[in-house]
């Protein structure tokens, strides 16, 4: 019989050992061994025995003893067994933004390794065991899935091998693979809410307010306005799980007609839009004309009011008849016109909305001068010593200068609080003048002695 | 991972027994071995046999052999048959799980798994 | 016959200090064949060092081992109260002969 040891072995890839061949007889007619693997004979050995040095031990491998005994051949295997850690421990790369609630396949290719029965591939978050599997196949790849949520984001993602060589003295060797870092998102399936105006008019300016609630995480959250071909520059506030996008935009004649509003929220490889029909409109102010802004009175006066063509005018609060974008009336200019505000109000109709614009026109009327009875009294009667205040007011446009002169020089004081004496009395010649020309008038005044009894 | 041995009795000498060690958490594969040793009460360690887990190839103390003999029966367990037991048998019988390290040449068994033991009495 | 003797069968030290104990072979042993184990009683032996220096998975680092051929040593330092138990040698030889020392207990004061 043909003895060897050891009968099994474990060693590193690339490692040696010694085996010892021997014969159950004294003197055995052959004895040795037969290994594919390089083979060192140890000197001396003995009648029956030989010791070999196994060396470069790559993989598994069965050197096999034998011997030729009188009473026959025989042989006997050792089992050798190589271990190395795997080569290659990878994490196939995750996507770069992953929907919270959908699941994740993690995915783990393994190359080299043995023994693979004591090979086991673990997937890992963070530290935590997702999964653990034998490691089958070359290259071994294990997958594990896993639901995916927000208290992922961030979270680090690997593989790890473990040979486990404690069955044989030796230790746990543990490969891990780089971390993948995954990004996590939620988009909510409600789009965003677009608040801003249906109609806008040529050169004004308008706010556009884009929100959206339920995003996670918000600070990677990119917003897109813009109206028609032209791109709006927002200011956004980020709220806990909220983002609010607000925009100024001013449009020009261009862009006159039907334009697209747009609201794109991105996040992850994901985008919720919101779309809005905005009409671009053109609304000049009415035009207001009169014959001649400055007429004198007497004179026949015609108002016209003019809007855009598909515009409704009121001049005067009166619609215009037939209702259209004109509007007139005639009128003879008194002094009463003087400073009259011709108002002119435009109604358009856009999208279902009606506009307003107004326009404002003043008439001067040019009359006088005037010095009336009622204005300007011909006569007072004062006590003496009697504080008065003397008065006359003369009209006209341009308003005439006055003057009230006695004797062509001692004037009256025209609305000044006085004391009446005596030398206040008598007639006094009041001259209004303006570009328009004067009118005189005479005013007298007459002062009551006091009776002393 | 554990191993219990089992079969442990008091017997009269000149008798026969059969010892079992079972593997619980780790199964069968070349390379490491299933090993034998006693200890008689108040002594120290004996070795008494191998078996390789992949081979089956047993090896045994010079004392051991002839009366002693160690089989794999399944994946998780060996055995050990004793016959013509003496006084000089009882002891504590431990089965111990353990590798033939090899680091720059020839090796030696280690033994990092035993079992609680069994204890085998000897006595008229 | 090859034989491990371990001249000691009783050391005794205090709490915090430390203690060794050795272990000759009647033949030379690779350093690959010498193994230390720790026994308390009514338990089963536990695996300290192998490979006459290797640490066991899970064992402290105040066990150390050492020597080569026939002398070897093992180093137990910051003594604890646990550590009190008989200390084993274990060693092979070629043409598969194992054998274990007569075992040195340890007392801790």
């Known amino acids: 019989q043909t003895s060897v040891f050891p009968p099994e072995v474990i060693l590193p890839r690339g490692g040696s050992v010694k085996v010892n061949c021997s014969a159950s007889c004294d003197q055995p007619i052959s004895l040795g061994m037969e290994t594919p693997l390089p083979k060192k004979e140890i000197l001396p050995g003995g009648n029956n025995w030989k010791m070999y040095e196994l060396s470069n031990v790559q993989e598994d491998s069965q050197p096999m003893c034998y011997s030729n005994c009188p009473d026959g051949q025989s042989s006997a295997k050792t089992l050798l067994t190589v271990y190395w850690t795997p080569e290659r421990v990878e994490l196939a790369p995750l996507p770069p933004w992953q929907p919270v609630g959908k699941n994740l396949t993690l995915r783990c290719q393994v190359e080299g390794g043995a023994p693979r029965a004591n090979l086991t591939v673990m997937l890992l978050r963070g530290e935590k065991e997702l999964s653990r599997q034998s490691a089958v196949g070359e290259p071994a790849e294990v997958t594990t899935t896993v639901p995916v949520g927000r208290d992922d984001h961030g979270a680090n993602f690997s593989c790890r091998t473990e040979l486990d060589l404690r069955p044989y003295v030796l230790k746990l060797f543990e490969n891990t693979s780089a971390p993948h870092q995954l990004q996590t998102f939620d988009l909510p399936a409600t789009p965003p809410q677009l608040v801003s105006p249906q109609v806008l008019e040529v050169d004004t300016q308008g706010t556009v307010v884009c929100s959206l609630d339920g995003l996670f995480p918000v600070s990677e959250a990119q917003v897109s306005l813009a109206l028609g071909d032209q791109k709006l520059n927002p200011t956004i506030t980020y709220g806990n799980n909220s983002l609010s996008a607000k925009a100024s935009v001013k449009v020009t004649a261009e862009e006159e007609g039907t334009q697209q509003l747009l609201c794109g929220v991105m996040l992850g490889n994901q985008t919720q839009e919101t779309r809005q029909t905005v009409t671009i409109y053109s609304f000049p102010a009415p035009n207001v004309n009169l014959t001649k802004p400055e007429v004198s009175e007497g004179t026949e006066v015609i108002v016209e009011c003019e809007a855009h063509p598909r515009a409704k005018v009121m001049l005067n609060g009166v619609p215009a008849q037939p209702p259209g974008p004109r509007a007139q009336f005639l009128l003879k200019a008194t002094p009463e016109d003087n400073g009259r505000s011709f108002s002119c109000s435009a109604t358009l109709e856009v999208a279902g909305q009606l506009v307003h614009k107004n326009q404002t026109r003043e008439l001067r009327v040019l009359y006088g001068p005037r010095l009336d009875e009622k204005d300007c009294p011909g006569n007072w009667t004062w006590p003496e010593n009697s504080q008065q205040t003397p008065m006359c007011q003369a009209w006209g446009n341009p308003l005439p200068q006055l003057k009230c002169l006695k004797d062509g020089t001692f004037p009256l004081p025209i609305g000044q609080s006085v004391t009446v004496t005596r030398d206040l009395e008598g007639t006094y010649l009041c001259q209004a003048r303006s570009t328009r020309g004067e009118v005189t008038r005479e005013v007298t005044v007459n002062v009551l002695s006091p009776r002393y009894e | 991972q554990s191993l219990e041995e089992s079969g442990g009795d008091l017997v009269k000498p000149g008798a026969s027994l059969t010892l079992t060690c079972t593997a619980s958490?780790?199964?069968?594969?070349?390379?490491?071995?299933i090993c034998w040793v006693r200890q008689a009460p108040g002594k120290g360690l004996e070795w008494i046999a191998c078996i390789g887990a992949g081979s089956g190839a047993a090896y045994y103390a010079s004392w051991a052999k002839g009366r002693f003999t160690m089989s794999k029966t399944s994946s998780t367990t060996v055995t050990l048959q004793m016959t013509s037991l003496t006084a000089a048998d009882t002891a504590t019988y431990f089965c111990?799980?353990?590798?033939?390290?090899?680091?720059?040449?020839?090796?030696?068994?280690?033994?990092?798994?035993w079992g609680p033991g069994t204890l085998v009495t000897v006595s008229s | 016959a090859q034989v491990l003797t371990q001249t000691a069968s009783s050391v005794s030290a205090t709490v915090g200090g430390t203690v060794t104990i050795s272990c000759q072979s009647s033949?030379?042993?690779?350093?690959?064949?010498l193994a230390w184990y720790q026994q308390k009683p009514g338990q089963p032996p536990k695996l300290l060092i192998y490979s006459a220096s290797t640490l066991a998975s899970g064992v402290p680092s105040r066990f150390k081992g050492s020597g080569s051929g026939t002398q070897f040593t093992l180093t137990v330092s910051d003594l604890e109260s646990a550590d009190a138990a008989t200390y084993y040698c274990?060693?092979?030889?070629?043409?598969?002969?194992?054998?274990f020392g007569g075992g040195t207990a340890v007392v801790v004061k």
């Open positions: 111990a799980r353990g590798g033939f390290v090899v680091g720059g040449g020839y090796g030696g068994y280690c033994f990092n798994l």
């Open positions: 958490g780790f199964s069968s594969s070349s390379g490491y071995y």
């Open positions: 274990a060693g092979g030889y070629s043409g598969n002969i194992f054998a």
């Open positions: 033949e030379s042993v690779d350093v690959n064949n």
